[in-house]
Amino acid sequence: HTAAQDNCTCPTNKMTVCSPDGPGGRCQCRALGSGVAVDCSTLTSKCLLLKARMSAPKNARTLVRPNEHALVDNDGLYDPDCDPEGRFKARQCNQTSVCWCVNSVGVRRTDKGDLSLRCDELVRTHHILIDLRHRPTAGAFNHSDLDAELRRLFRERYRLHPKFVAAVHYEQPTIQIELRQNTSQKAAGDVDIGDAAYYFERDVKGESLFQGRGGLDLRVRGEPLQVERTLIYYLDEIPPKFSMKRLT
């Protein structure tokens, strides 16, 4: 891998340390926090990005109604354990030996327990619903133009195969982007919908992980599309296991 030509940086991940110590003096970049070598021609996994973030210094509608198994990331940031491929380990524990099971996007899907808690497998998040609210505009965006712009964004910026963008719904001012990717659909080299959603979330928050041009420039027929709220729902291939007390 050669990173940016002028100064050995990682165009797809700011949270790296890069140096020209790869084979043949090529630029090699390692994620902060884990020291794992990353491929700067594609997205870095969410697990490695969260780990890097924790190591950094502190500072009758067309809209879909998420079903009762949809998860929202209410727990916020934590320092995750990643496997050698950069995926979340199924069981995560904190420094006080409190443990829980997570899905493939690192969101808790069980009650918290102790070190005896078993998480047999990493359950795949196969459906992600990104719920956006855009800032007021003179009028509603044309739905087909909005759909085309968001599909183009995920294809170009996140390199997500178009088949994984299942739908774009719009009911002013709410936009919903549905990403779907079953285990059987994901081929080697395909960007994971969880990673694409995380990069998108950081982009719309003005915290872009990309080097270079910086933030998003979303426009629908020249009109800026500015997002003022984001909520992401995660649906797993196997429903989560929470006790009833959490649901009341």
Partner: antibody, heavy 126, light 103 residues
Framework: AVTLDESGGGLQTPGGALSLVCKAS????????MFWVRQAPGKGLEWVGV????????NYAPAVKGRATISRDNGQSTMRLQLNNLRAEDTGTYYC???????????????????WGHGTEVIVSS | ALALTQPSSVSANPGETVKITCSGS???YGWFQQKSPGSAPVTVI????KRPSDIPSRFSGSTSGSTGTLTITGVQADDEAVYFC????????FGAGTTLTVL
């Protein structure tokens, strides 16, 4: 069909300024990044600069940085290159080109150019 | 910026397959055909493997690591030209050009 037409070339004096215009047609200009690329006589292609689709971002080659300004008028489907303090080494054919990947993290790359203009010749000489 | 490296010349008989390589960047490669000095370049491949609709299917592109490859399958006399590769991670760069001679 995608058409890019450059104009404004000709004989220029050293130290002077030139203004080249690229007029686009056959596609939604507002949806594409645009490039300027030049070629000195008998030499290879040289990336001059890029402007994103909204005009909010520009980037320039070191050889022209500080002397070049790229702007665009999406209503008129035109892009302009203003180059000041002309030097003999600015001589060449200047091409307008279209970038196919406006959201890409490396969208400044020449690797995304999918269409070219016919070029306009610039000669800087006293 | 690092230069993109491509061979200065290649030659082939009509009907043969020609491969032109370009190395030096992990970004997206484009390939541009120029039939004579001063004539406008024509994009034959952009974004690694995408071919404009008016370009014959005998032109294809691929990448592996930091190397891009332009393949012309069943080369024709009309393909004789200089081929420039283009790429960059942060600012645009072109290779010096490869002259394709069809024998």
């Amino acid at each position: 069909a995608v058409t890019l037409d450059e104009s404004g070339g000709g004989l220029q004096t050293p130290g002077g300024a030139l203004s080249l215009v690229c007029k686009a047609s056959g596609f939604d200009f507002i949806d594409y990044d645009m490039f300027w690329v030049r070629q000195a006589p008998g030499k290879g292609l040289e990336w001059v600069g890029v402007i994103n689709r909204s005009g909010s971002y520009t980037n320039y080659a070191p050889a022209v940085k500080g002397r070049a300004t790229i702007s665009r008028d999406n209503g008129q489907s035109t892009m302009r290159l203003q180059l000041n303090n002309l030097r003999a080494e600015d001589t060449g054919t200047y091409y307008c080109a279209r970038g196919a990947c406006t959201h890409c993290w490396d969208a400044d790359s020449a690797g995304y150019i999918d269409a070219w203009g016919h070029g306009t010749e610039v000669i800087v000489s006293s | 910026a690092l230069a993109l490296t491509q061979p200065s010349s290649v030659s082939a008989n009509p009907g043969e397959t020609v491969k032109i390589t370009c190395s030096g960047s992990s970004g997206s490669y484009g390939w541009f055909q120029q039939k004579s000095p001063g004539s406008a370049p024509v994009t034959v491949i952009y974004w690694n493997d995408k071919r404009p609709s008016d370009i014959p299917s005998r032109f294809s592109g691929s990448t592996s690591g930091s190397t891009g490859t332009l393949t012309i399958t069943g080369v024709q006399a009309d393909d004789e030209a200089v081929y420039f590769c283009g790429n960059a991670d942060s600012s645009g760069t072109f290779g010096a050009g490869t002259t394709l001679t069809v024998l």
